[in-house]
């Protein structure tokens, strides 16, 4: 009689070979479908889909029967453990195929989407190319706005109902894997259970990201206020030198990353540029080179060479109008020793360090090739994300860029160049971090339900305000779905991997430079051409999930916790230097503060009082009644007193503010264009002249409803019909 | 000539409360708009709040959210800082500052400070 332990082995050995097969299918119709959006591939895609689900759920439950307490081998046991949690297939048939096609939909739609030019509707753009371009080199802040409202106007208003249903399906999955929310699934990724001081929880992470959120705070806060004064240059009387930044000027269109203000924030503009764009055009380089690049210094440290598989396979260009492409970089394990990289690269100094990153993730996906099946994953998934992280920070270095030509060889450091190369970091490094904290918060409470779906926007930009310091240059209502603008959101990955993946990443960096023999301060070193480094990392990449990653953190860098210390440490030149430059401007911003704030009218109105019993509810039917009866005043006055024909409609009226007592504030826009908004004053006299006929709409008077600023009319209140 | 004068400084016990004033002379306060900073012993200086040119806005350091406020009375030409639920940490020597330009990120003119201790 065997034991279940060795059952169990038999059964996973037998698992794994037919998984192999199954699992390459469905990857492979999965990339085809991404490379080339067509209906058809999405149908094959779906089918592959189905039969690797099919089997999974089948072995899934075939799993079940082998008791984990009776497991001693770690191996077999973690693997277990991975096959007994079921998914997605713990929904019934058609809850799990309206779940597939919402996802299918919403990622289809994020990577179709289009913006088209008001006055030319032939004129489109997709996102990726064109609106990304608007949003990392446009100086106009209208233009920005334009690309940046029409984006969530056009794509996010489509992805709210799918996303209303997305929250509601996926919290029933986690549930039924006896997770309390989706939330909690997705933070099950750190979890660590039965190893002896290596166990982490759940729970755990949401306390570590809390408190290391704490700690990064100060840093964050100097760099707000330095970027702050910076963008008032840029953008004169747009920004409250005590206010929040607007989002739509934070270089790219989510504010995720500040990397492309940094030509507006150099510190030291008359040093050589470190941004090594330029240098990248005039030597001609290309994808190709960008990637080969890339390679050499994997290569360098004692790492493999990618396969030729991946070379012959992988998309590294756009293919244009050939065919639709999901755009947003990824790097795939297929299966079956097939990797590739799908990314739309652009010959930036950006996308040289994006290319270094996807491949850190072919890295790691390569180095656990030959752990069993379940167990070939990041140690979590911040884990995967750094790996490539780690690289970059070596590759951005002045001295690293020196070597491989792209600054020139006379390039000289001193504490200028120190400050400029380290302001270039914060930006995409710091700046990203309260975005990413503050995002996946937002879905951890709307997972949990802490927020009502008719509060989503509301506590988006409360949030966003209160915690980012950023503030929408436009109201959204609820309408709209803003998270779902960005592709993480829209395309189901779990996103405080970013968050966790900084805080290793600079661990690890500490660990793999002191492994290279480097002397001096963490930010000027570059581990490239240290095998002893190289043999580091991959000694930890190697086991996969196969250990905690608690131990393969300690393995590493002597620590079983994320630290935020060596980040912090790595940016201490800089945090002087920016506490010196803030010293005499205001660090910290006012949630009040809005874009369209000076051109808003405050609105109350009493029901109650005015109605007594009467009294009807406000609503957004009585909303949408409110911005029409504006729209109709706007017309009239444009008419009457202009001799101008506008036809404003209710969705130029934009309302912010609503306070459950009924209180609002509004504004009003040219039709068609966000960026016009009509000067107060303007819609003050719009108000005065139409004012009776307003009040009559809502069966009230100047006092009841109450616009604040404009003086009351002459008219007689508001007389009830006879009857 | 432009001039601000701190007062209302002192020693008060862990939770207590003190009013600071800022007197302005030399310009126009509902023109510039007015902050708050402090200085601890051996520490830098630190933004505390500060307040629009119109009064419209206001905003807190992390530290004293909710506990302090600042507000101005354009009549008088004078700034304030109600600071409630004193913390041994608010200890400090407080500085107004008047802004360069109203929509501008820096502050030009500084008072001589007033000194609050915050012990029991």
């Known amino acids: 009689q065997s034991t279940i332990e060795e059952q169990a082995k038999t059964f996973l050995d037998k698992f794994n070979h037919e998984a192999e097969d199954l699992f390459y299918q469905s990857s492979l119709a999965s990339w085809n479908y991404n490379t080339n959006i067509t209906e058809e591939n999405v149908q094959n895609m779906n089918n592959a889909g189905d039969k690797w689900s099919a089997f999974l759920k089948e072995q899934s439950t075939l799993a079940q029967m082998y008791p984990l307490q009776e497991i001693q081998n770690l191996t077999v046991k973690l693997q277990l453990q991975a096959l007994q949690q079921n998914g997605s297939s713990v929904l019934s048939e058609d809850k799990s195929k309206r779940l597939n096609t919402i996802l299918n939909t919403m990622s289809t739609i994020y990577s179709t989407g289009k913006v088209c030019n008001p006055d030319n509707p032939q004129e489109c753009l997709l996102l990726e190319p064109g609106l990304n371009e608007i949003m990392a080199n446009s100086l106009d802040y209208n233009e920005r706005l334009w690309a940046w409202e029409s984006w969530r106007s056009e794509v996010g208003k489509q992805l709210r109902p799918l996303y209303e249903e997305y929250v509601v399906l996926k919290n029933e999955m986690a549930r039924a894997n006896h997770y309390e929310d989706y939330g909690d699934y997705w933070r099950g990724d750190y979890e660590v259970n039965g190893v002896d001081g290596y166990d982490y929880s759940r729970g755990q992470l949401i306390e570590d990201v809390e408190h290391t959120f704490e700690e990064i705070k100060p840093l964050y806060e100097h760099l707000h206020a330095y970027v702050r004064a910076k963008l008032m240059n840029a953008y004169p009387s747009y920004i409250s030198p005590i206010g929040c930044l607007p989002a739509h000027l934070l270089g790219d269109m989510w504010g995720r990353f500040w990397t492309n203000l940094y030509s507006l924030t150099v510190p030291f503009g008359q040093k050589p540029n470190i941004d090594v764009t330029d240098a990248m055009v005039d030597q001609a380089w290309d994808a190709q080179r960008i990637f080969k690049e890339a390679e050499k210094f994997f290569v360098s440290v004692g790492l493999p060479n990618m396969t030729q598989g991946f070379w012959e396979n992988s998309m590294l260009t756009d293919p244009g109008n050939v065919q639709k492409a999901v755009c947003h970089p990824t790097a795939w394990d297929l299966g079956k020793g097939d990797f590739r990289i799908l990314m739309c690269t652009k010959v930036t100094m950006d996308d040289f360090l994006t290319a270094h990153h996807e491949m850190g993730h072919i890295q790691y996906d390569m180095a656990y090739a030959a752990q069993p099946f379940l167990l070939r994953n990041g140690a979590n998934e911040g884990f995967h994300e750094a790996v490539g992280e780690i690289m970059s920070l070596s590759a951005a270095t002045p001295k690293h860029l020196k070597s491989i030509g792209l600054l020139s060889p006379d390039f000289q450091e001193d504490n200028e160049t120190e400050i400029n190369f380290l302001l270039k970091q914060a930006l995409t490094i710091v700046g990203t971090l309260p975005f990413t904290y503050m995002l996946e918060k937002w879905r951890w409470m709307v997972f949990k339900g802490e927020i009502p779906k008719d509060q989503w926007m509301k506590k988006w930009w409360e949030m966003k305000r209160e915690i980012v310091g950023v503030v929408e240059p436009v109201p959204h209502d609820e309408t709209y779905c803003d998270p779902a603008s960005l592709f993480h959101v829209s395309n189901d990955y779990s996103f405080i991997r970013y968050y966790t993946r900084t805080l290793y990443q600079f661990q690890f960096q500490e660990a793999l430079c002191q492994a290279a023999k480097h002397e001096g301060p963490l930010h000027k070193c570059d581990i490239s051409n240290s095998t002893e480094a190289g043999q580091k990392l991959f000694n930890m990449l190697r086991l996969g999930k196969s250990e905690p990653w608690t131990l393969a953190l300690e393995n590493v860098v002597g620590a079983k916790n994320m630290n935020v210390r060596p980040l912090l440490n790595y940016f201490e030149p800089l945090f002087t230097w920016l506490k010196d430059q803030n010293k005499n401007s205001f660090v910290g911003w006012s949630t009040d503060w809005s874009p369209y704030a000076d051109q808003s009218i405050k609105v109350r109105i009493s029901l109650k009082s005015a109605l007594g019993d009467k009294a009807y509810e406000w609503n957004d039917n009585e909303m949408y009644l409110f911005r029409s009866s504006v729209a109709y005043a706007m017309r009239q006055y444009f008419l009457k007193v202009k001799n101008q024909m506008i036809l404003f409609g209710e969705e130029d009226v934009r309302v912010a503010n609503l306070k459950p007592r009924i209180s609002f504030n509004f504004f009003v826009t040219a039709p068609k264009n966000v960026s016009d908004i009509i000067p107060r004053t303007e819609v003050e006299k719009a108000i005065r002249m139409s004012r009776s006929r307003i009040n009559d709409a809502f069966r009230l008077n100047d006092n009841s409803l109450e616009f604040l600023g404009i003086q009351p009319t002459l008219g007689p209140p508001n007389q009830p019909p006879v009857s | 000539e432009v001039q601000l004068v701190e007062s209302g400084g002192g020693l008060v016990q862990p939770g207590g409360s003190l009013r600071l004033s800022c007197a302005a002379s030399g310009f126009s306060l509902d023109y510039y708009g007015m902050g708050w900073f402090r200085q601890a012993p051996g520490k830098e200086r630190e933004s505390v709040a500060a307040i629009s040119w119109n009064g419209d806005f206001t905003a807190y350091a992390d530290s004293v959210k909710g506990r302090f406020t600042i507000s101005a009375d354009n009549s008088k030409n004078t700034a304030y800082l109600q600071m409630n639920s004193l913390k041994p940490e608010d200890t400090a020597v407080y500085y107004c500052?008047?802004?360069?330009?109203?929509?501008?990120?820096?502050?030009?003119?500084w008072g001589q400070g007033t000194l609050v201790t915050v012990s029991s």
């Open positions: 500052a008047k802004r360069a330009n109203p929509t501008g990120a820096y502050f030009d003119y």
